[in-house]
């Protein structure tokens, strides 16, 4: 799998999309996990609704949301209020039994907020009880890693 880079600005929202073959993955739940080290396990962050028919419902874990368009074949992950510690390698997965197929490897990069010299009071973030539909989502910048690029810093 190639790795796709998604860049977002600190403090804003980043949307990651993972296209897949809707027929091949019909009836399967999906998940978003974080890779722990180059050879380490992929730790589950959030997964789609337990009832596959309701996969389009947005599921939250903290500031990360997942929703699945099972007809169109697009899994969408939203990282709200992006922070530097969110940077790293992730995977979109398709689940079947205890197994998981990788749909896409994703490198999340967090760029410094160009407004961070401003007073924090000038910035707006959606409150917990506000509809997420009202929140501004920053369009992500994505690219594939070039061959030979390493998503993790080399370990000594």
């Amino acid at each position: 799998h190639n790795t796709t880079v998604f860049q977002g600005v600190a403090g804003q929202s980043l949307q990651v999309s993972c296209p897949y073959d809707s027929m091949k993955h019909w009836g399967r739940r999906k998940a978003w996990c974080r890779q722990l080290g180059e050879k380490g396990p992929c730790q589950r962050v959030v997964s789609t609704h337990n009832l596959w028919l309701l996969s389009f419902l947005r599921r939250w874990n903290g500031s990360t949301a997942i929703t699945d368009d099972t007809l169109g074949g697009t899994l969408t992950i939203t990282l709200r209020n992006l922070q530097p510690h969110d940077a790293g390698l992730y995977q979109c997965q398709s689940l079947h039994g205890s197994e998981a197929d990788t749909l896409r490897k994703v490198l999340v990069e967090v760029l410094a907020d160009p407004l961070d010299h401003r007073d924090a009071g000038d910035l707006w973030f959606p409150g917990e009880s506000e509809s997420f539909e009202d929140a501004h989502v920053e369009h992500s910048i994505s690219r594939s890693l070039l061959e030979g690029e390493i998503p993790f810093p080399p370990t000594s």
Epitope: H49, N50, L51, L54, F56, W60, L71, E133
Partner: antibody, heavy 118, light 107 residues
């Protein structure tokens, strides 16, 4: 703002059928699920079934399997619930409810009273 | 099917008091649990989804907690408009089921 408007009260004879409508205004109709829930007089809530309009996929509670049909007409943003072989214990207020974003019963219709009496 | 048992059936309290409502599932529903409020002659209204998330426009005095089989809805300080029937609901597994309800009445 999304609203669900249901058809008016019905009085039916035992053995007959009833078809209740639920018209959605605002929002995208096709993408979301429409469920039907009923409530007998003085009783609790009972889920009957759900339909996803854009795929036409439906799922029904076992109790109503074979007696209930849920359909959706995307062109009019209207969902329907038809219940056949009515009996007196089907007397209830029938609600439609739809998803908005995070959960299956975000928004509810005003309810339709169906009375089954000979 | 998953059975949701709510307790107590009736809770008699005065305005300003704290209300604690319980919902117990016959098997784990993870966090796939919602709470609704229903007043006489009205449709139910969503209060809490995913066990602990307040729905849009719901006052902060309503809070939900729990995971697995045991869940709690807390109303920190009852307002006159909070006297109603409250239902829990799970969508972890088909069929979707509701609890029998807890009536919160004025003492």
């Amino acid at each position: 703002q999304v609203q669900l408007v249901q058809s008016g009260a019905e009085v039916k004879k035992p053995g007959s059928s009833v078809k209740v409508s639920c018209k959605a205004s605002g929002g995208t109709f096709a993408q979301y699920a429409i469920s039907w829930v009923r409530q007998a007089p003085g009783q609790g809530l009972e889920w009957m079934g759900v339909i996803i309009p854009d795929s036409g996929t439906a799922n029904y509670a076992q109790k109503f399997q074979g007696r209930v049909t849920i359909t959706a007409d995307e062109s009019t943003s209207t969902a329907y619930m038809e219940l056949s072989s009515l009996r007196s214990e089907d007397t209830a207020v029938y609600y439609c409810a739809r998803t908005q974003e995070n959960t299956i019963f975000d928004i509810w219709g005003q309810g339709t009273l169906v009375t089954v009496s000979s | 099917e998953i059975v949701l048992t709510q307790s107590p059936a009736t809770l008699s309290l005065s305005p300003g008091e704290r209300a604690t409502l319980s919902c117990r599932a016959s098997q784990s529903v993870s966090s796939y649990l919602a709470w609704f409020q229903q007043k006489p002659g009205q449709a139910p209204r969503l209060l809490i989804y995913d066990a602990s998330n307040r729905a849009t426009g719901i006052p902060a005095r309503f809070s939900g907690s729990g995971s697995g089989t045991d869940f709690t809805l807390t109303i920190s300080s009852l307002e006159p408009e909070d006297f109603a029937v409250y239902y829990c609901q799970q969508d972890y597994e088909w069929p979707i089921t509701f609890g029998g309800g807890t009536k919160v009445e004025i003492k």
